[in-house]
């Protein structure tokens, strides 16, 4: 069967396909800042917030100098379902705070569905396990407060750009190797 | 007010090693990449690496991967790079650079730091 | 790695006529709307500052005389009307793969 529809063909060149999955990163990357700023602007944050449900970032010393092109797709995968998984509970239950950035944060996870599709078919191109998450999927309950559901879009939207950031370093210096 | 200010400018024999500093002010430190750029004179600009300061490791243009260390204090909203077994073709001014996530271009540049080395 | 290429290597003009600069890659920097070059402005002394990203983007602060254009392998920066602080090398850089790459700059001088 041909890619889903929606999905445009990927190539026979692997440096092709990574150019494209670091297209959409790069736009998802660009995407997430705008609307990073935007929440700042709304709803100021005061220092870092973070969420025990997230994913640990990917980025660690060292980890950039020995990638592996399976390791970064299957743990971008994961990462970017988790962070795709947060977002829809974000829209579903962040409550009227969160309403003014609807159709942003709609668009968003709309970009992170169609990023998925083309790490899905990059990984079947390259013939790697579509891998499931690690650990098992922690069940998101609704905010404790309005405040809780904007720390919460401060800690996803940092933790998805910051992701990002190291997807398309990972991706570029793997591109390099091919 | 977005600062980037460098350690003063060092000279250094063949074969030693040198660690420049930049220090970030006036924006949030973890928000940018901090990358490298060489000036020697009479060549074209050229970079040297980035780092993620929020904990991600460096990466490096190949031409430099081996000498070039970069390195963060986040706490002090500081980067290093250190540049070891420096040669004559090293005598430069080198700048940081604040970089954007995933884009690779640099809005704020520190004054830049000059190194000679010399016997 | 991909190589840029300005020309002129140098030009002169006078205050208030238009500077036209070329930057030329050697192979596209460019992908489905987005073009990775951006334009900087460096004095002699100075670190290099920032005039447009991602092909035509204004960075903050930047005059309005300033404009950025092109795609796949062929940029040019316009300056419309030059003033006296104009007079500067210009780089052109790329950001399209690693590692980021700059071309060898245009000087613009006072005629």
């Known amino acids: 069967p041909g890619p889903p529809a929606g999905s445009p063909r990927v190539s026979s060149d692997p440096r092709a396909d990574l150019d494209s999955a670091v297209l959409l990163t790069r736009s998802l990357l660009a995407d997430t800042r705008q609307l990073a700023a935007q929440m700042r602007d709304k709803f100021p944050a005061d220092g870092d917030h973070s969420l025990d449900s997230l994913p640990t970032l990917a980025m660690s010393a060292g980890t950039l100098g020995s990638l592996q092109l399976p390791g970064v797709l299957t743990r971008l995968r994961v990462d970017l379902m988790s962070y795709l998984r947060h977002v829809q509970w974000l829209r579903r239950a962040g409550g009227p705070s969160l309403k003014t950035l609807e159709p942003e944060l709609g668009a968003l996870q709309a970009r992170l569905e169609r990023l998925l599709r083309r790490l899905q078919l990059l990984m079947s191109r390259l013939a790697l396990p579509q891998a499931a998450p690690d650990q098992p999927v922690i069940p998101l309950g609704p905010p404790a407060s309005a405040w809780g559901s904007i720390r919460a879009a401060h800690a996803i939207l940092g933790g998805l750009h910051l992701t990002l950031d190291w997807a398309v370093r990972g991706l570029l210096l793997l591109k390099t190797r091919l | 007010e977005v600062q980037l200010v460098q350690s003063g400018a060092e000279v250094k024999k063949p074969g030693a090693s040198v660690k420049i500093s930049c220090k970030a002010s006036g924006y949030t430190f973890t928000d940018y990449n901090m990358d490298w750029v060489k000036q020697a004179p009479g060549q074209r600009l050229e970079w040297i690496g980035d780092i993620n300061p929020h904990g991600g490791g460096p990466i490096y243009n190949q031409k430099f991967t081996g000498r070039a260390t970069l390195t963060v204090d986040k706490s002090a909203s500081t980067a290093y790079m250190e540049l070891s077994s420096l040669r004559s073709e090293d005598t430069a001014v080198y700048y940081c650079?604040?970089?954007?996530?995933?884009?690779?271009?640099?809005?704020?540049w520190g004054q830049g730091t000059t190194v000679t080395v010399s016997s | 790695d991909i190589v840029l290429t300005q020309s002129p290597a140098s030009l002169a003009l006078s205050p208030g006529e238009r500077a036209t600069l070329s930057c030329r890659a050697s192979?596209?920097?460019?992908?489905?709307?987005?073009?990775?070059i951006h334009w900087y402005q460096q004095k002699p002394g100075q670190a290099p500052r920032l005039l447009i990203y991602?092909?035509?983007n204004l960075d903050s602060g930047v005059p309005a005389r300033f404009s950025g254009s092109g795609s796949g392998t062929d940029f040019t920066l316009t300056i419309s009307s030059l003033e006296e602080e104009d007079f500067a090398t210009y780089y052109c850089q790329h950001s399209r793969d690693l590692p980021p790459t700059f071309g060898q700059g245009t000087k613009l001088e006072i005629k």
């Open positions: 991602l092909a035509s």
């Open positions: 192979k596209s920097v460019s992908t489905s709307g987005y073009s990775y």
């Open positions: 650079a604040r970089g954007e996530l995933g884009h690779w271009y640099f809005d704020v």
